[in-house]
Each structure stands twice: as C-alpha cells, then as structure tokens.
Amino acid sequence: HNTTVFQGVAGQSLQVSCPYDSMKHWGRRKAWCRQLGEKGPCQRVVSTHNLWLLSFLRRWNGSTAITDDTLGGTLTITLRNLQPHDAGLYQCQSLHGSEADTLRKVLVEVLADPLDHRDAGDLWFPGESESFEDAHVEHSISRSLLEGEIPFPPTS
C-alpha cells in the first residue's frame, strides 16, 4: 500500500477520503484506526454503523466522524478541530468477521495555524501540498508516498 498524506491546519477540520471497490467490499462495515508508531498495531478509532445499510449515517467518536458511501465506494473520515496530537499514521479498513483489509494507509499531518503562529515564516494557507519525487498528488490536500520509496539503511 502507498501512504497518502493528508495535511490539515491545527484548529480546523480535515476530511480524509478512502476510495474502494464497492462490489468487492459489498456488505462490509468499515473502520478508521490509528497505527502506533511506524510498525505498531492499529487501534480502532471509529467504525461505521453496525447495520451496513445504515453506513451512510455519520458516527462520531470524540472529534472523529466516519461515513460510508457504499454505492460510490468512498469512506470519509472527518477530524474536527484538528490538534497537533492527531498527527500520525492511520488506516482505512474494510471489516469481515474478525479480519480487516487495509483500504488505504494515511499519514495525517498537522500544520501550524499561521494566524496562531505569528512568528511563523513562509505563511501558507491550505492548498495543494507538494508531492514527493515519483509520487502523485491525489487531490488538493493529499499526496502519496510509495512505500519503500525512501530507502533506509537499517538504523529523524
């Protein structure tokens, strides 16, 4: 899986979209989980409605909401009032029994609010983020990282 970067501004809302094959995942509930570190387990944050037919209903856990367009094949997660500690690695998952398939790996990046950080230089406003070499911009607030794109010898 590629990792897609979604950038959000502290204090604002961030919407993460996870497209999937609606036929392949027909009848499956979805979930949003947070990975502990780079290689740790993924802890469930929120999941769609227990009744798959009601997956379009928005479900909240704290400041995180999830809703699923099962016909269009798009899972949408909203992080409201984004905070620095919301930054991290996440996954969109498709659930079947006790198993979970990863739909998309997501890196949520929290950027400083230029209005709050008056000592910040190069003031910017949310827009198209830079893409890494050989990576494509998914849409205005995301970019993809190819896993293994940045080679590391075993060893910030």
């Epitope: 990792t3 970067v5 950038q7 570190g37 780079e38 620095p84 500690h85 930054a87 991290g88 690695l89 890196l107 949520v108 990046e109 929290v110 950027l111 400083a112 709050d116 950080h117 008056r118 000592d119 910040a120 230089g121 190069d122 910017w124 983020s129 830079e130 893409s131 890494f132 970019r143 990282l145 794109e149 940045i150 590391f152 075993p154 060893t155 910030s156």
Partner: antibody, heavy 120, light 106 residues
Framework: EVQLVESGGGLVQPGRSLKLSCPAS????????MAWVRQAPTKGLEWVAS????????YYRDSVKGRFTISRDNAKNTLYLQMDSLRSEDTATYYC?????????????WGQGTLVTVSS | NIQLTQSPSLLSASVGDRVTLSCKGS??????LAWYQQKLGEAPKLLIY???SLLTGIPSRFSGSGSGTDYTLTISSLHSEDLATYYC????????FGGGTKLELK
C-alpha cells in the same frame, strides 16, 4: 536505531554563509516533521526553524527570517539549514531535531549538534 | 509569542528527594507543554509531552501536571543520574523554551 548527525558547522565571519546538513537514519524520514534548534554557549535552547514532511511548509523564528532557509531532501533522508548574512548572535550549537509522525510541534530525537561560531 | 518562565533557575536537592520544577507561561498553553532534560555536553532528551504524557522508556518517577499557564515537572525520588538542566517547552502558539532549571546535588 534513530540517528541524526549534524555537519557543516565551523568558524565563519559575520555576513558570510554556512550550510548545515543532517542525514537521518533509523526511521522513515518522509513521515516526520523536522526542525533546527540552537543553543548559544552556556545559554538555553532556542527554536530556529521547522519544516513539514514534504517540505512545502516552513516556519522561522523572527530573528532568522529572510536569512535562514530550512529545507529537506526526502530522497536523501537529509535535513538542511542554509544560513546567510550570519551575525555574531547566531553563534551556537545547532541541533537537528525530529518531530513526531506528521508533525514538528515537539521533538522526540535530537542529533549531537554542530557548533557554529560567527566571529571576525 | 508565549514566554515561559522557569523557577527556580537553580535547585539543590539530595538523592531520594521529591523535586518539583515550575514553568509559567505568559498566556494559556492549553496543555501543549513538554519537558526536556539536558545533561552537560549532551543533546536534550524529551521526557514528557502534552503536559503529562511520559515518553516510552522514561522512568515513572518523572511526572508532569498543570493547566492554563502553570505547569510542573515532578521527580518523585531523585536519582543521581537526574542531575541535569530541565527545560519546559510550549507548542500551543509558536515554539518557545523556558530558560531552564539546573538541578544540582545539595
């Protein structure tokens, strides 16, 4: 093991330039916000500049704005600090610091620092 | 910018003592406060972030507390290896460090 190794420091005359480098290893560099923090001899810590994971967003303290440029090369896993128009008050040990995944609000790992001395 | 004032600037204590270090902000910090330990000739080391979250691998004798503008780092029982300078650091508005508290042996 996370490693950050600063280089490029040294003695430089006021008004001149210097470029610091910080190759990183032991983690997926492109996942992390990065920063430079400095410490003048026998003084406290002072945040200098931060950069987002992709390098598209940068932040500077007022006293270095327009003179210093933070950048990164994710293909080379390296953080840089280009320092121009150096002043005597820029004399300090410069630390390369790693933020957390997706942010450079706080710094979880630091290099050992490189000393920059600005003097005529 | 938020200014951070640490007190005392120098603290003498004995091994086994309960030690309390203070950090006061010029504005509300919203719990976005971290504590760093720096030993002589070494790079700073993160101990605590978001006021009271202990970094993995940091001994449990270290704890953080506070809210608003007033924050505290507590060492429940001082060890000799804890002798160092401690800096508070806020990331609520801008990024600023306190002036530091040097902890020395009495």
């Amino acid at each position: 093991e996370v490693q950050l190794v600063e280089s490029g420091g040294g003695l430089v005359q006021p008004g001149r330039s210097l470029k610091l480098s910080c190759p990183a290893s032991g983690f997926t560099f492109s996942y992390y916000g990065m920063a430079w923090v400095r410490q003048a001899p026998t003084k406290g810590l002072e945040w200098v500049a931060s950069i987002s994971t992709g390098g598209g967003n940068t932040y500077y303290r007022d006293s270095v704005k327009g003179r210093f440029t933070i950048s990164r090369d994710n293909a080379k896993n390296t953080l840089y600090l280009q320092m121009d128009s150096l002043r005597s008050e820029d004399t300090a040990t410069y630390y390369c610091a790693r933020g957390d995944i997706g942010t450079a609000y706080w710094f979880t790992y630091w290099g050992q620092g490189t000393l920059v001395t600005v003097s005529s | 910018n938020i200014q951070l004032t640490q007190s005392p600037s120098l603290l003498s204590a004995s091994v086994g003592d309960r030690v309390t270090l203070s950090c006061k902000g010029s504005q509300n910090i919203n719990n976005y406060l971290a504590w760093y330990q720096q030993k002589l000739g070494e790079a700073p080391k993160l101990l605590i972030y978001k006021t009271n979250s202990l970094l993995t691998g940091i001994p449990s004798r270290f704890s953080g507390s506070g809210s608003g503008t007033d924050y505290t780092l507590t060492i429940s029982s001082l060890h000799s290896e804890d002798l160092a300078t401690y800096y508070c650091y806020q990331y609520n508005n801008g990024w600023t460090f306190g002036g530091g508290t040097k902890l020395e042996l009495k």
